[in-house]
Protein backbone atom coordinates (compact mmCIF):
# COMPACT_ATOMS: atom_id res chain seq x y z
CA UNK A 1 0.00 0.00 0.00
CA UNK A 2 1.34 3.42 -0.91
CA UNK A 3 1.95 6.00 1.76
CA UNK A 4 1.63 9.72 1.22
CA UNK A 5 2.21 12.69 3.50
CA UNK A 6 -1.06 14.45 4.22
CA UNK A 7 0.48 17.75 3.13
CA UNK A 8 1.94 16.44 -0.12
CA UNK A 9 -1.10 17.12 -2.27
CA UNK A 10 -2.06 13.47 -2.43
CA UNK A 11 -5.11 12.03 -0.71
CA UNK A 12 -5.19 8.52 0.70
CA UNK A 13 -8.74 7.44 0.04
CA UNK A 14 -8.58 3.77 0.99
CA UNK A 15 -5.78 1.92 2.71
CA UNK A 16 -5.81 -1.42 4.45
CA UNK A 17 -4.36 -1.07 7.93
CA UNK A 18 -3.26 -4.00 10.06
CA UNK A 19 -3.15 -4.08 13.86
CA UNK A 20 -1.86 -6.77 16.20
CA UNK A 21 -4.63 -8.22 18.34
CA UNK A 22 -2.31 -8.68 21.30
CA UNK A 23 -1.90 -4.89 21.47
CA UNK A 24 -5.52 -4.59 22.55
CA UNK A 25 -6.08 -7.90 24.32
CA UNK A 26 -4.72 -11.37 24.86
CA UNK A 27 -5.64 -12.86 21.50
CA UNK A 28 -3.06 -13.47 18.82
CA UNK A 29 -3.49 -12.63 15.18
CA UNK A 30 -3.95 -9.62 12.99
CA UNK A 31 -6.91 -7.27 12.84
CA UNK A 32 -7.60 -5.70 9.47
CA UNK A 33 -8.99 -2.18 9.37
CA UNK A 34 -9.56 0.35 6.63
CA UNK A 35 -8.53 3.98 6.57
CA UNK A 36 -10.91 6.15 4.59
CA UNK A 37 -10.16 9.84 4.32
CA UNK A 38 -7.77 9.65 7.26
CA UNK A 39 -10.26 7.89 9.55
CA UNK A 40 -9.79 4.25 10.55
CA UNK A 41 -12.97 2.19 10.34
CA UNK A 42 -13.44 -1.47 11.23
Amino acid sequence: DAEFRHDSGYEVHHQKLVFFAEDVGSNKGAIIGLMVGGVVIA
Epitope: E3, L17, V18, F19
Partner: nanobody, 124 residues
Framework: EVQLVESGGGLVQRGGSLRLSCAAS????????MGWFRQAPGKEREFQAA????????YYADSVKGRFTISRDNAKSTVFLQMNSLKPEDTAVYYC?????????????????WGQGTQVTVSS
Amino acid sequence: EVQLVESGGGLVQRGGSLRLSCAASGRTFSNLNMGWFRQAPGKEREFQAAISRSGGTTYYADSVKGRFTISRDNAKSTVFLQMNSLKPEDTAVYYCAAASPGGPINYGRAYDSWGQGTQVTVSS
Protein backbone atom coordinates in the same frame (compact mmCIF):
# COMPACT_ATOMS: atom_id res chain seq x y z
CA GLU B 1 13.85 6.76 21.35
CA VAL B 2 15.27 3.40 20.38
CA GLN B 3 18.44 3.12 18.31
CA LEU B 4 18.40 0.56 15.51
CA VAL B 5 21.35 -0.81 13.54
CA GLU B 6 20.80 -3.12 10.58
CA SER B 7 23.29 -5.55 9.10
CA GLY B 8 23.37 -8.48 6.72
CA GLY B 9 22.70 -6.82 3.40
CA GLY B 10 24.77 -7.46 0.30
CA LEU B 11 24.83 -8.72 -3.24
CA VAL B 12 23.19 -12.05 -4.01
CA GLN B 13 22.13 -13.86 -7.15
CA ARG B 14 18.52 -14.51 -8.10
CA GLY B 15 17.15 -17.38 -6.03
CA GLY B 16 19.63 -16.79 -3.22
CA SER B 17 19.10 -15.99 0.42
CA LEU B 18 20.09 -13.31 2.91
CA ARG B 19 19.43 -12.84 6.60
CA LEU B 20 19.10 -9.28 7.82
CA SER B 21 19.57 -8.41 11.49
CA CYS B 22 18.55 -5.35 13.43
CA ALA B 23 20.03 -4.68 16.87
CA ALA B 24 18.06 -2.36 19.14
CA SER B 25 19.10 -0.34 22.17
CA GLY B 26 17.72 2.50 24.24
CA ARG B 27 14.31 1.18 25.21
CA THR B 28 12.79 -2.05 26.45
CA PHE B 29 12.80 -4.07 23.26
CA SER B 30 10.05 -6.45 24.34
CA ASN B 31 7.63 -3.51 24.56
CA LEU B 32 7.96 -2.68 20.87
CA ASN B 33 6.41 -4.00 17.70
CA MET B 34 9.07 -4.31 15.02
CA GLY B 35 8.85 -4.04 11.27
CA TRP B 36 10.90 -4.20 8.10
CA PHE B 37 10.35 -1.81 5.20
CA ARG B 38 12.18 -1.34 1.93
CA GLN B 39 12.72 1.48 -0.51
CA ALA B 40 13.87 0.99 -4.08
CA PRO B 41 15.32 3.92 -6.05
CA GLY B 42 12.57 6.27 -7.18
CA LYS B 43 9.86 4.37 -5.31
CA GLU B 44 7.86 4.84 -2.15
CA ARG B 45 8.97 3.15 1.03
CA GLU B 46 6.95 -0.05 1.38
CA PHE B 47 6.08 -2.37 4.23
CA GLN B 48 7.53 -5.88 4.14
CA ALA B 49 6.94 -7.63 7.46
CA ALA B 50 6.15 -7.00 11.11
CA ILE B 51 6.30 -8.96 14.34
CA SER B 52 4.47 -8.39 17.59
CA ARG B 53 6.09 -7.68 20.96
CA SER B 54 5.93 -11.31 22.04
CA GLY B 55 6.89 -12.67 18.65
CA GLY B 56 3.63 -14.60 18.61
CA THR B 57 2.11 -12.78 15.64
CA THR B 58 3.68 -11.92 12.30
CA TYR B 59 2.31 -10.20 9.23
CA TYR B 60 3.71 -9.94 5.70
CA ALA B 61 3.20 -7.98 2.53
CA ASP B 62 1.68 -10.16 -0.17
CA SER B 63 4.77 -9.75 -2.33
CA VAL B 64 7.05 -11.50 0.19
CA LYS B 65 4.66 -13.96 1.84
CA GLY B 66 6.15 -17.44 1.76
CA ARG B 67 9.63 -16.13 0.90
CA PHE B 68 10.50 -13.85 3.83
CA THR B 69 10.33 -14.73 7.53
CA ILE B 70 10.50 -12.22 10.35
CA SER B 71 11.57 -13.31 13.82
CA ARG B 72 12.92 -11.76 16.99
CA ASP B 73 15.09 -12.57 20.00
CA ASN B 74 13.91 -10.44 22.89
CA ALA B 75 16.80 -11.58 25.09
CA LYS B 76 19.23 -10.12 22.56
CA SER B 77 17.07 -7.15 21.49
CA THR B 78 17.36 -8.21 17.88
CA VAL B 79 14.92 -8.71 15.02
CA PHE B 80 15.69 -10.73 11.90
CA LEU B 81 14.44 -10.94 8.35
CA GLN B 82 15.23 -14.18 6.57
CA MET B 83 14.87 -13.61 2.83
CA ASN B 84 14.73 -16.63 0.54
CA SER B 85 14.10 -17.08 -3.19
CA LEU B 86 15.25 -13.53 -3.80
CA LYS B 87 14.34 -11.78 -7.05
CA PRO B 88 15.88 -8.76 -8.79
CA GLU B 89 12.77 -6.77 -7.86
CA ASP B 90 13.67 -7.27 -4.18
CA THR B 91 16.64 -4.94 -4.71
CA ALA B 92 16.27 -2.01 -2.30
CA VAL B 93 17.49 -0.45 0.91
CA TYR B 94 15.91 -2.37 3.78
CA TYR B 95 14.99 -0.54 6.97
CA CYS B 96 14.21 -1.86 10.41
CA ALA B 97 11.67 0.15 12.41
CA ALA B 98 10.21 0.13 15.91
CA ALA B 99 6.71 1.10 16.97
CA SER B 100 4.91 1.45 20.26
CA PRO B 101 1.99 -0.99 20.49
CA GLY B 102 -1.45 -0.07 19.26
CA GLY B 103 -0.74 1.50 15.89
CA PRO B 104 -1.14 0.02 12.41
CA ILE B 105 1.89 -2.17 11.80
CA ASN B 106 1.88 -1.90 8.00
CA TYR B 107 1.89 1.92 8.00
CA GLY B 108 5.28 3.61 8.08
CA ARG B 109 4.11 6.72 9.89
CA ALA B 110 3.15 4.59 12.91
CA TYR B 111 6.83 3.80 13.49
CA ASP B 112 8.81 6.33 15.50
CA SER B 113 12.32 4.87 15.25
CA TRP B 114 14.21 3.83 12.12
CA GLY B 115 17.58 2.33 11.34
CA GLN B 116 19.95 3.70 8.75
CA GLY B 117 19.15 0.92 6.30
CA THR B 118 21.09 -1.87 4.64
CA GLN B 119 21.42 -2.33 0.88
CA VAL B 120 20.19 -5.55 -0.70
CA THR B 121 21.03 -6.11 -4.37
CA VAL B 122 19.76 -9.14 -6.26
CA SER B 123 21.41 -9.79 -9.61
CA SER B 124 19.84 -11.77 -12.41
